[in-house]
Every structure is written in structure tokens, then in C-alpha cells.
């Protein structure tokens, strides 16, 4: 069976029907359907006016405008808001009421596309394998990234979050139109990785998506990840404005000027520095989502009531931090180079700036405890990777799972750890699953491009597709049309259960309490440490006229803008040419390993940069307020509260081992989410809902943080912060 031309709100579209084998099964593929009008720089997306005739939807459209990997030119287009659909078909009748899975790509909110990198004439985010193996409809789409997607003045002049609104437009388009393709508009599952996983999380928390999303999967990124929310957008907006010659003294004039500046110039005005980094690379990524008082009405930690009816899977890779650790400390991947205590202490201190000497020393001691018994280089290098994995991915994900569980009504919660080791040949043998290593298995690459994969890789891919698509169908990864290797139990705050995904899975794959000691350290001990003053904590930004974006000082005061905790991390753009530089980490949607770089350049493989990892920017919140639920001090690691946030957050009391959302106060009650008075009522975007207002305009260096529901005034968040 095949669909033929399909009528959508924009008009008729016609895709391609691809036959699969001799049994008569096929897949209808639609590429390049517009879901919004061509974008205007730094404006919200607008509906597409539609077209006459039948749109031939047979080729992927260009990605949204972004810098190339060398950051010296751009590619993509401003006219980029298009989506792609894969619909599996049986032999006889066209499909009806299929579950729908919408993929959101990663790439540090800086790069990427809905189709991903091309390898062996197969795109990374080609939905065919998931669609046909799982009998679901797969949708991928483009959204704006970098300055064009996320530049914000922190006020109504340029509220930001344009890329998130693009994502919402795509989700809403699917809701309105997918029935015509054979999908069930009441069974939509979002899934995404890295910045895409964080985006999935943010979309479930936004009141704009009320009623649109049934289930969600966050892979290596959640709304609470420290690199997801930009607390000082004005700092970054001014950096770009200065670069393109716009006035910075008045926010309104600056905004007007930025809107009429050549979008390519805006894109190139922001560069992630590549060498001589004084701080961890992820401190330098600035254009990520913000708390705008509307689309994201409050600190994400306070919005979990909005996801109370959405089934949720979240997880990480066991060495998600490897790519970032290897950028921050290149010795990690070099057998002939050593990691010293001094190196690690320096790294730790850069991640714990606002907790000063005590923060650095305590954290260092906790992580190096095993070094006395095992001083081997392998152990030390693994420690560095574990440290960045914990801070950037694992701890925030655990907190998100606990928040979801604590707020859920009927919704189910599941956790996983992906541990199938990286296929990157240049990595040491001890390296586990690096950031973005999971993507290729979810998208069935071992089946689509069998060359270079082993039977065990197909086993992993088959299992992941089965769990993911069963979950999309029923809300339970064990139940659906696909057999699974072992039973995946739900996550609860009592058991902290998670499924470890490996090549051999059985009943022992269901585990409990992942890295509990470290989780407890970050959410309890570390948070309780006093925050040092701005003067003590503020690093001196690099001087001179270098192209590199200076690291903004930490702190929240006028003089000390919050450090770019921001966005993530596209890992640094690799050196061009055939320098002996180590392989560039996975970039955006590059191809998850083992996919080497596309093109026939002799460049070393570009590992996937999923998206990722900017430094932990905590949710803003009501910081100093004691036991308000995991507000703020959720525990998003290690970015301690900066500036004069007031007294350090009061850590949750009680020594129960049920982090990461420990009960507030000493009561055993789960955290109360301050969303109005009904537990489930989503925080509305407008009105006097209590959602914080869009912060006032003005020219202060630090963008005002809108107050959250129960704060008396806009204080610094109580989540850990650099």
C-alpha cells in the first residue's frame, strides 16, 4: 500500500514510496515539508501560508543557517523550517493510527539538522529503520540554532528561545496534520539526544505544548543539565552586537540593529574558541535557551507539574563526558601523556568556581578517593571522564527523573544507562559509550549500513529500537509489537532502577542506584558548601583582541556577568588541514561513530558532537528560599549559585538515600511544585498565572532573572552553578 498525495494544512504533498523486500512492505517518505514560513532573523516563527498544486516532498531541505566546523564560513539557509516523515506501510491497506515519534537533534544548540550527516549515502537521522522495524511514524525537522535561534537580551526586546519555538511549531504541525499520513495525533512521542534531549525535556515543561505530547525520551540531556539555560543572555548578545557593529548601550536599539544585520554576519560573530582555553570548553557556549517568562515561564525545576501526564524515559551514556574531558584535558586519549593530580585539580576548580577553595578541594577529594589504591593512568583518566559525565549529564538526568516521578500522576518513568563501548578506533580501549554513541543504534545504522558493524552492534540496535518504539506505542518499553531482551522496570524514587543497555542483556541488566555516592555528593554535600563572593570567584577573562569569545566573569552582579554557562557544547571545532591534531569530537549531527567524517578529506574522524555539553547552568530559581522543592537547588551539578544569591541553598534534609529529589524540609513528602494550586495545572504562559513576567528591559549587564512563583524577588538560582 502507499499513500500517494496527502492533503495537509499547507496543501497537497507527495513523497516517495520505497519498496522493502519481496513481501510487499514499503515505506512512504516525505522530505522537506514546510511547517512554518521562512524565518525572519530573531523573530518568532510564523505559520506557512501554504501552496497550490502538489508539493513534491522528495529531498531534504537545507539545514538552518550555522557556522561550518571551521567557523570561518556558514552553510544552511534562513529558509529552513521543514520536516521529514517516514510512514511504514503493509502490503494491503494504508497504515492508520500509528504512534508518532518526533526526533529533535542535538548539536549544542549551535549546529545540526533534521537529517544529520551523510555516510555511505545514508543520513544519520534517517527514520526508515525505526519506522519499519517498530511500525511507527518517524518525523524529523530543522530548528534554528546558534545566535539566530537563541540570542536574547533577557527582556522583551529579544526574548530568545526562537529555536525552541520552531520546535514547538513542528510538534503542533504534526498534531494537526499527522492523521492524514496515518498517524495518531493523540500518541506523539518526542525523542532527542544531547541538546535535543534537553529540548525534548523543555518542550514537555513548556505550557505551550499542553495536550500535544504523550511521551518523551531524553538521551544524554535534560532541561536541568547545567549547559541548557543561559543565565546571562545579555552578555552574549552584546558580544555579538559589538562584533557586527551594533550599539550596545541601549537594549532596544541594539535589538533593532541585530534584527536587520546580515544573518550570516550574526552567525559568524560567535565563535567557540578552539585553543588556549582557560576554562572548560563548555563555559564558552553562549546561545542556548533562556527563562523568558513565557515559553519557559520559570526555572525548569519548577515546571515538572506540566509533565505530570507525559510518560518519560531518560538516560545517559556511561562515558558521555569523555569527549568533553578529552577537549579539556587532551592527555586523556594519549597513551604517552599523563594526567596528574595537578591537572585534575585545576579542571575541578574551574567547574566549581563559585564554591571557591572548599568546593574544589572537597570535589577533588571525593573523586580521587580511588587513586590511592589504583594510581594507574587508566584509573585517573577514567576519573576525569566520570567527573565530566556526572556534572554535565548523569546527575542532572537523575534529578530530572526524580522530579518527573515526584510530579507524575498516571505517567510512567524509566531510566537507562547506555554502555555499549565506542567504536572510535582512535580511542583508548577503556573508553565506554561516548557522547552521541547511542544515536547510531537508535536509528538502526548497523542494519542500514552493515559495513563496519558487527552482529553484537545489530543486537544492541534491535533492542533499542524495540524498547523505544514499544514505549511510543504503549508507554511501557516492554509492551508492544517488538520482543525485548529483558524486562525494563520503571524508575521509582525508592529503587532508582535503571536498565543498562549492552550487547548482552538479561535479568542482571536491571540495576539500581547508579553512582549514588556521587549523586549524593553533588545534591547534598556540594550544595551545602558556602558560596564565595564575586571577587573571590571571578576569573579574569582573557584579554587582548583574540577572536575567542572571552569567558564572562561569574557572578550575577552588574560587574560580574554569569559565566556563559550555557549551551553546550559543540565540541570545539577541529583544526582544519592535516594537522596532527586529535580527532575532533563528534560534532552535532555528525555521524555518530563509527561514522567517519563525510567527504573524502583526510581529516580524522569527527566523532558525533551530539550536542551537548555546556557547563552546568542551573535552573534559576528561588534560590535562597529554603526547602522549596528542588527548586533551584535541584542539584544540577556543579554550577554553584553565583554572586550575591544570598545564603547557600539549604540542602534537602534527611539522610534517606532517595535522592536526587529529596523531600523538602524534613517531611517525607515529595517536593511541591509551585505551579498554581492544582498539582497538575500547567503553568500558563500568560496572564496572572504566576508565571514570571518577561523581565524588564534595560541595559543592565546581567539579564534579569524572572522571579519564580514563590520567590519574593528575582534571586539567583539555588542550583549549583559555575
Amino acid at each position: 500500500a502507499k499513500l500517494g498525495a496527502v492533503y495537509t494544512e499547507g496543501g497537497f504533498v507527495e513523497g516517495v514510496n520505497k519498496k522493502l523486500g519481496l513481501l510487499g512492505d514499503s515505506v512512504d517518505i516525505f522530505k522537506g515539508i514546510p511547517f512554518a514560513a521562512p524565518t525572519k532573523a530573531l523573530e518568532n516563527p510564523q505559520p506557512h501560508p501554504g501552496w497550490q498544486g502538489t508539493l513534491k516532498a522528495k529531498n531534504f531541505k537545507k539545514r538552518c543557517l550555522q557556522a561550518t566546523i571551521t567557523q570561518d564560513s556558514t552553510y544552511g539557509d534562513e529558509d529552513c523550517l521543514y520536516l521529514n516523515i517516514w510512514v511504514p506501510q503493509g502490503r494491503k491497506q494504508v497504515s492508520r493510527d500509528l504512534p508518532v515519534m518526533i526526533w529533535i537533534y542535538g548539536g549544542a544548540f549551535l549546529m545540526g539538522s533534521g537529517h544529520g550527516a551523510n555516510f555511505l549515502n545514508n543520513y544519520l537521522y534517517d527514520g526508515e529503520e525505526i519506522a519499519t522495524r517498530g511500525n511507527v511514524i518517524v518525523v524529523t525537522f530543522n530548528y534554528r540554532v546558534g545566535p539566530l535561534g537563541f540570542l536574547s537580551t533577557g527582556d522583551a526586546n529579544l526574548p530568545g528561545n526562537y529555536g525552541l519555538r520552531d520546535q514547538h511549531m513542528a510538534i503542533a504541525w504534526v498534531k494537526r496534520n499527522i492523521a492524514a499520513f496515518g498517524g495518531d495525533p493523540n500518541n506523539i512521542t518526542l525523542f532527542g539526544e544531547s541538546a535535543g534531549g534537553a529540548s525534548v525535556s523543555l518542550q514537555t515543561l513548556s505550557p505551550y505544548n499542553k495536550g500535544l505530547i504523550r511521551r518523551a525520551i531524553s538521551q544524554s540531556g535534560v532541561a536541568l543539565s547545567p549547559w541548557v539555560i543561559q543565565k546571562n543572555p545579555l552578555f552574549w548578545a552584546k558580544k555579538v552586537a559589538e562584533k557586527v557593529g551594533c550599539p550596545v548601550g541601549d537594549a532596544a536599539r541594539m535589538a533593532q540593529c541585530l534584527k536587520v544585520t546580515d544573518p550570516r554576519a550574526l552567525t559568524l560573530a560567535y565563535k567557540v574558541p578552539l585553543a588556549g582555553l582557560e576554562y572548560p570548553m563548555l563555559h564558552y557556549v553562549g546561545f542556548v535557551p533562556v527563562i523568558d517568562g513565557d515559553f519557559i515561564p520559570a526555572d525548569p525545576i519548577n515546571l515538572y507539574a506540566n509533565a505530570a501526564d507525559i510518560d518519560y524515559i531518560a538516560g545517559t551514556n556511561n562515558m558521555d563526558g569523555h569527549i568533553f574531558a578529552s577537549i579539556d584535558m587532551p592527555a586523556i586519549n594519549k597513551g604517552n601523556k599523563k594526567v596528574t593530580e595537578e591537572d585534575f585539580y585545576k579542571l575541578v576548580s574551574e567547574f566549581t568556581i563559585t564554591k571557591g577553595l572548599r568546593g574544589a578541594k572537597t570535589t577533588f577529594d571525593v573523586y580521587t578517593e580511588s587513586w590511592a589504591q589504583d594510581p594507574s593512568q587508566e584509573n585517573k583518566k577514567k576519573t576525569v571522564v566520570d567527573f565530566e559525565t556526572d556534572v554535565l549529564f548523569l546527575v542532572p538526568t537523575e534529578i530530572a527523573l526524580a522530579q518527573h516521578r515526584a510530579n507524575a500522576k498516571s505517567a510512567k518513568t524509566y531510566a537507562y544507562l547506555f554502555s555499549h563501548p565506542s567504536r572510535m578506533p582512535v580511542y583508548p580501549k577503556w573508553v565506554g559509550a561516548d557522547h552521541a554513541d547511542d544515536i547510531q543504534y537508535v536509528f538502526g545504522k548497523p542494519f542500514a549500513t552493515p559495513t563496519g558493524y558487527r552482529p553484537q552492534d545489530r543486537t544492541v540496535s534491535k533492542a533499542m529500537i524495540a524498547y523505544w518504539t514499544n514505549f511510543a506505542k504503549t508507554g511501557d518499553p516492554n509492551m508492544g509489537d517488538s520482543a525485548v531482551p529483558t524486562h525494563w522496570e520503571p524508575y521509582t524514587t525508592e529503587n532508582s532502577g535503571y536498565l543498562e543497555i549492552t550487547k548482552k542483556m538479561g535479568s542482571s541488566s536491571m540495576k539500581r542506584s547508579l553512582r549514588t555516592n556521587f549523586l549524593r555528593y553533588w545534591t547534598l554535600t556540594y550544595l551545602a558548601l558556602p558560596t564565595v563572593t564575586d571577587q573571590e570567584a571571578t576569573p579574569v577573562p582573557p584579554t587582548g583582541d583574540s577572536e575567542a569569545t572571552p569567558v564572562p566573569p561569574t557572578g550575577d552582579s552588574e560587574t560580574a556577568p554569569v559565566p556563559p554557562t550555557g549551551d553546550s557544547g559543540a565540541p570545539p571545532v577541529p583544526p582544519t588541514g592535516d594537522s596532527g591534531a586529535p580527532p575532533v569530537p563528534p560534532t552535532g549531527d555528525s555521524g555518530a561513530p563509527p561514522v567517519p567524517p563525510t567527504g573524502d578529506s583526510g581529516a580524522p574522524p569527527v566523532p558525533p558532537t551530539g550536542d551537548s555539553g555546556a557547563p552546568p547552568v542551573p535552573p534559576t530559581g528561588d534560590s535562597g528560599a529554603p526547602p522549596v522543592p528542588p527548586t533551584g537547588d535541584s542539584g544540577a551539578p556543579p554550577v554553584p549559585p553565583t554572586g550575591d544569591a544570598g545564603p547557600p541553598p539549604v540542602p534537602p534534609t534527611g539522610d534517606s538515600g532517595a535522592p536526587p529529589v529529596p523531600p523538602t524540609g524534613d517531611s517525607g513528602a515529595p517536593p511541591v511544585t509551585p505551579t498554581g494550586d492544582s498539582e497538575t495545572a500547567p503553568v500558563p504562559p500568560t496572564g496572572d498565572s504566576g508565571a514570571p513576567p518577561v523581565p524588564p528591559t534595560g541595559d543592565s549587564e546581567a539579564a534579569p532573572v524572572p522571579p519564580t512563583d514563590d520567590s519574593k524577588e528575582a534571586q539567583m538560582p539555588a542550583v549549583i552553578r559555575f
Epitope: G4, A5, V6, T8, G11, G50, Q52, T54, R176, N177
Partner: antibody, heavy 119, light 105 residues
Framework: QVQLVQSGAEVKKPGASVKVSCKAS????????MHWVRQAPGQGLEWMGV????????SYTQKFQGRVTMTRDTSTSTVYMELSSLRSEDTAVYYC????????????WGQGTLVTVSS | DIQMTQSPSSLSASVGDRVTITCRAS?????MNWYQQKPGKAPKLLIY???SLPSGVPSRFSGSGSGTDFTLTISSLQPEDFATYYC????????FGQGTKLEIK
Amino acid sequence: QVQLVQSGAEVKKPGASVKVSCKASGYTFTSYNMHWVRQAPGQGLEWMGVINPGDGATSYTQKFQGRVTMTRDTSTSTVYMELSSLRSEDTAVYYCARDYYGSSPLGYWGQGTLVTVSS
Amino acid sequence: DIQMTQSPSSLSASVGDRVTITCRASPSISYMNWYQQKPGKAPKLLIYAASSLPSGVPSRFSGSGSGTDFTLTISSLQPEDFATYYCQQRSSSPTFGQGTKLEIK
């Protein structure tokens, strides 16, 4: 100017079929989608489906799937809507309507055709 | 299917009055169109894409809104404006609101 002229009123018995025509003039026939909308006596408007006169592609709302067929004749710039297995509740005025621009605002309407289903 | 709730279902007003009709969509929609229908006649497009006026429609008609809430406003009612008004959402299966009958007070 754009004109859509529909065929005359029809009286049909339950179980029968009816075929209503809509002749277009004043524009390039194959360039704009044509929709069919019906209105039962004293009731609101109900969208039935759409045809692209250029390639004949059609889409029908779920309610009429299997009972409605929309066709076109490019030589006479006419679209047709056939509704089968008629029941008394199909008694209504049937309108053809052309897209205004882009998609979906129905900018030009025929005068309507009353179809009465009665035994 | 997308649900359209139009209110009020009927209203009485006088010439010169300002009149507002609302239409709520669930879930959110991209565009809203408004039509005017007089007894025994075909509907006429009044507003498209939430706020745009086709040529020939008087400027006293205006539309606003986005997402879920949309409004049709007639700034100063004229005798010829007494009719039934319908909103219509655009999706793969367009639907109309149930109509608002505007009568002379």
C-alpha cells in the same frame, strides 16, 4: 472574474448516489485546489474534502471516506463530487469553494446545490 | 480532530455597536479564517490567516489572535452586517466553528 457555477438541485432516494458539478471560469483551473463543503438545513458548515485539479489528487475527511469521490475534467474546467449510499441526513446544500491563495481560506464559492434525500 | 468552540452562538446588537466574536481551538492552530453568511447565500471570506482582509472587505472588520484564541471584531455595525459568522481552522482536515448569529436588537 472568478466564477464557480454549480449544477441544479437534486432529489434522491436513500441508498442512491448523487453527482454534483462545479464549473470554474475566470482563472487557471489547474492552479487552485477545489473544496466541497456542505450545510444541512439550519446547521453549520461541514468540510467534506478537496481535489487538486492539476493532478487529480484528493483528500476526504474521515466521515465521508469510502462514500465520496471527487473528480475533475480539465477540458471543461469542471470538478465533480459524487456521494453514494445516500441517507436522509445527507440532505444539505453542497458548495464547491476555491482556495483564495496558498491553502485553505476558501475565497470563492459556488452558489450551492440543494440535495434532498427522501423516500 | 481539532475542536472549535465559537462564542457566543447568537448575539443582538444595534447599528454602530462594536461587536466581538471569539473562537477557541484545541489544540493550537496555525491560521484562523472567518466567513460571513447571509440566509440563502453562500459564505463569503471575511478574514484569512487570523488578521488579513481580502480585497473588498470593509476595514471595520478585523481579526486577531494566535495559537488557541482568536477574535473577530466589527468596530461599528452596519445594517448589512447582520448575518451568521463562522470561524474555520486550517489543518489536514479543516473544521468550522458552529457559527454566531448576529441579529438586530
